[in-house]
């Protein structure tokens, strides 16, 4: 999916008002210096591509974050403010229902969500030069 035509300001507002808080809740009890940010993004469409991948694609050691509250809200924001995004999710939703697993917060998941926090922060500051 190409995130170029999303309403970035609306997505940013949703992040600032609610998604960011859910990410913090998920990470509660973890030191902010515990994980190094290894995933980066260069512009807003790229950031959303990375955010989607890290939020919804299962990875080794972290089977699924998709049922977490921050993920549900991310999915909603993309569906509402990214043209045509919802139709790409029809089959994905059916597949996710089939493989729904028990929620387990592993260290790998905490690391992944820490990366997500970094990506979201970068998304909110699109004019900053890449380090």
């Amino acid at each position: 999916y190409d995130f170029t035509n999303c309403d970035f300001e609306k997505i940013k507002a949703a992040y600032l008002s609610t998604i960011s808080k859910d990410l913090i809740t998920y990470m509660s009890g973890t030191k902010s210096t515990e994980f190094n940010n290894t995933v980066s993004c260069s512009n807003r469409p790229h950031c959303l591509t990375e955010i989607q991948s890290l939020t919804f694609n299962p990875t080794a050691g972290c089977a699924s974050l998709a049922k977490e509250m921050f993920a549900m809200k991310t999915k909603a924001a993309l569906a509402i403010w990214c043209p045509g995004y919802s139709e790409t999710q029809i089959n994905a939703t059916q597949a996710m229902k089939k493989r729904r697993k028990r929620k387990v917060t592993t260290n790998k998941c905490l690391e992944q969500v820490s990366q997500l926090q970094g990506l979201w922060r970068r998304f909110n500051r699109p004019l900053l030069k890449q380090q």
């Epitope: 008002s17 909603a76 924001a77 045509g84 139709e87």
Partner: antibody, heavy 120, light 107 residues
Framework: QVQLVQSGAEVKKPGASVKVSCKAS????????MHWVRQAPGQGLEWMGT????????DYNQNFKGRVTMTTDTSTSTAYMELRSLRSDDTAVYYC?????????????WGQGTLVTVSS | EIVLTQSPGTLSLSPGERATLSCRAS??????VHWYQQKPGQAPRLLIK???QSISGIPDRFSGSGSGTDFTLTISRLEPEDFAVYYC?????????FGQGTKVEIK
């Protein structure tokens, strides 16, 4: 089963405001956005905007910007649409309709409609 | 804003005949089109979602097709209860919009 029950018909004077309610039951309220669509007598359907409880935010059709406010009360699973500075051409049936925001993505259930008549 | 144009405005047919309704979008919208039926004094009822996906409880004589800019709703054999107004809607991008409607009337 899923039900959206709207408030009763209203008669308003030009310049006044109207607030229409839509009480939802039979589903998880925050899993769906509530959209508002109106239909003037003998005319087609016009999307007015939506409120998304999950994100606690709204998005409006520019045609109504500044005149409309959409809210929800999650404790009672009720959505509200307030339209201000009413004009005679706001006379219409106003519908609420739910739409999934993390699945479904379509207006699959509608309220029965609320007739708002604007007349001096 | 995406404009949806439905044709014809009115379709005069007899029960048992096939009805073909068209909806054209002003720009490509992939498959983000849905079809609704509305009878006098009633709220719209969802018939088809995402261009061609069937809806539980809707008779299989209703079918949809198309993608991009051109979409079609087909009623294979008209029943007396099918005479109504039909609207297409796009949810590709905000603001969501509807076509102006096609009235299917008894000939």
């Amino acid at each position: 089963q899923v039900q959206l029950v709207q408030s009763g018909a209203e008669v308003k004077k030009p310049g006044a405001s109207v607030k229409v309610s839509c009480k939802a039951s039979g589903y998880i309220f925050t899993d769906y956005a509530m959209h508002w669509v109106r239909q003037a007598p003998g005319q087609g359907l016009e999307w007015m905007g939506t409120f998304i409880p999950l994100l606690d935010t709204s998005d409006y059709n520019q045609n109504f910007k500044g005149r409309v406010t959409m809210t929800t009360d999650t404790s009672t699973s009720t959505a509200y649409m307030e339209l201000r500075s009413l004009r005679s051409d706001d006379t219409a049936v106003y519908y609420c309709a739910r739409m999934g925001v993390t699945h479904s993505y379509v207006m699959d259930a509608w309220g029965q409609g609320t007739l708002v008549t604007v007349s001096s | 804003e995406i404009v949806l144009t439905q044709s014809p405005g009115t379709l005069s047919l007899s029960p048992g005949e096939r009805a073909t309704l068209s909806c054209r979008a002003s720009q490509p919208i992939s498959i983000s089109v849905h079809w609704y039926q509305q009878k006098p004094g009633q709220a719209p009822r969802l018939l088809i979602k995402f261009a061609s996906q069937s809806i539980s409880g809707i008779p299989d004589r209703f079918s949809g097709s198309g993608s991009g800019t051109d979409f079609t709703l087909t009623i294979s054999r008209l029943e007396p209860e099918d005479f109504a107004v039909y609207y297409c809607q796009q949810t590709f991008s905000l603001p969501y919009t509807f076509g102006q409607g096609t009235k299917v009337e008894i000939k």
